[in-house]
Interface confidence: low
């Protein structure tokens, strides 16, 4: 548990910026296994290695996350540090773990936020926690007392997402990542449904 | 190795507040969380809360709401709990310690590395 | 809140004995589950995670079980380093909650 994210954020720390940089112009254009998103462009050249291995882990879960990090490095000719994730790979039986549904497939059926509207606006409980991990980075002070001054958790939530239409992807990810911490069994729910 | 060394003993009146460290080595501070647990004399473990370093995101036990206050200085690799409005209630040893988390999996949140523990004392 | 109930809350044994503790939580935890252990004016030591982990340098005689709501740890053959107060702590609902801990001492 946890051993393939930090091996995957050690080879990628690993690299200089340089090969970092082409690390992902190659991750935009390497086959995926059906039913998974490719990790959009802009987003992606943006971010640094600890960046890139949560999004490889979101996206792609962690034994898949680790083959597709080995397959990149492979690739660029980097056999060493491939070979090292293959290592780890083995050790922690990630192979097992392969799941065969991505957690998250962005290019087929839009981000989970938008997919789980209605599902997160009956079941949220938790929308202080929810709006304090959001606070500044995503919500703005007015939008964020704007959401605090509704009175149920519905109406909380119904306010929140009048806000989902202006966010890209980073936001949806923030709002994602916060409903991870706070609510995990609602949204292994929803990814399961 | 991975260790979390805290603060030393705290003396304290009611009414008063505390700050207590909890220093990080021999890992990557910024992608791991960091958790506060209390322990009273002779009493079980209770999880105040967690902070995540790197984002400054916090969750707190509702039962700690208003009494403790979670940062971390990415820089020092060093993580703070202020304590505030002490009570006899609050004298216990508190501890940090680490959780591996990722963005997908909850399972992540044990504690793998505990801190050394901070005892803090509130007399009058 | 999650409770967790833990037992026994003491508990005797023998050297060579085989231990079993056990935690039920008040709702299924998805196996969210870790053992700690904790000696005198010692910080807690992590023994098992995801509720079957060995955590990193823990003697193979301990392991973990269970589902749903139901978790164990086993001590297979006790050692006199064994003595100690064990806890559960189920870490996949905010917030997360300990058991009331076991101390397990030498007959």
């Known amino acids: 548990m946890g051993r393939a994210r930090d091996a995957i954020l050690d080879a990628l720390e690993n690299l200089s910026g340089d090969e970092l940089k082409k690390f992902k112009m190659k991750l935009l254009t390497v086959q995926l296994r059906e039913g998974y998103g490719r990790i959009p462009r802009g987003a992606l050249l943006q971010m640094d290695a600890i960046d890139l291995t949560d999004k490889l882990v979101s996206y792609y879960l962690e034994s898949y996350g680790l083959e597709l990090t080995m397959t990149v490095l492979r690739d660029m000719g980097l056999q060493e540090l491939a070979e090292q994730l293959q290592t780890t790979k083995e050790e922690s039986g990630a192979v097992a773990a392969a799941a065969s549904v991505p957690a998250q497939s962005t290019a087929r059926t839009g981000h989970f936020v938008d997919q789980h509207r209605q599902a997160l606006i009956a079941r949220v409980t938790e929308v202080d926690g929810v709006l304090d991990a959001l606070h500044g980075s995503v919500l703005t002070e007015g939008q964020y007392q704007a959401v605090r001054a509704e009175t149920t958790s519905q109406d909380k939530m119904r306010k929140l997402f009048s806000f989902v239409p202006s966010w890209n992807l980073t936001c949806k990810d923030s709002l994602l990542q916060a409903l991870k911490e706070i609510h995990p069994y609602l949204v292994m729910d929803l990814e399961q449904s | 190795q991975v260790q979390l060394q805290q603060s030393g003993a705290e003396l304290a009146r009611p009414g008063a507040s505390v700050k207590l460290s909890c220093k990080a080595s021999g890992y990557n501070f910024t992608t791991y969380g960091i958790n506060w647990v209390k322990q009273r004399t002779g009493q079980g473990l209770e999880w105040i809360g967690k902070i995540y370093p790197r984002s400054g995101n916090t969750h707190n036990n509702e039962n700690f709401k208003g009494k403790a206050t979670l940062t971390a200085d990415t820089s020092s690799s060093t993580a703070y709990m202020d304590l505030r409005s002490l009570t006899s209630e609050d004298s216990a040893v508190y501890f940090c310690?680490?959780?591996?988390?990722?963005?997908?999996?909850?399972?992540?949140?044990?504690?793998?590395?505990w801190g050394t523990g901070t005892t803090v004392t509130v007399s009058s | 809140d999650i409770k967790m109930t833990q037992s026994p809350s003491s508990m005797y044994a023998s050297l060579g004995e085989r231990v079993t503790i056990t935690c039920k939580a008040s709702?299924?935890?998805?196996?969210?589950l870790s053992w700690y252990q904790q000696k005198p004016w010692k910080s807690p030591k992590t023994l098992i995670y995801?509720?079957?982990s060995l955590a990193d340098g823990v003697p193979s005689r301990f392991s973990g079980s269970g589902s749903g709501q139901d978790y164990s740890l086993t001590i297979s053959s006790l050692e006199s380093d064994d003595t100690a107060t064990y806890y559960c702590?189920?870490?996949?609902?905010?917030?997360?909650?300990f058991g009331s801990g076991t101390k397990l001492e030498i007959k």
């Open positions: 995801y509720a079957t």
């Open positions: 310690a680490r959780s591996p988390y990722a963005f997908y999996s909850s399972s992540y949140w044990y504690f793998d590395v």
């Open positions: 709702q299924d935890i998805k196996s969210y």
């Open positions: 702590l189920q870490h996949g609902e905010s917030p997360f909650t």
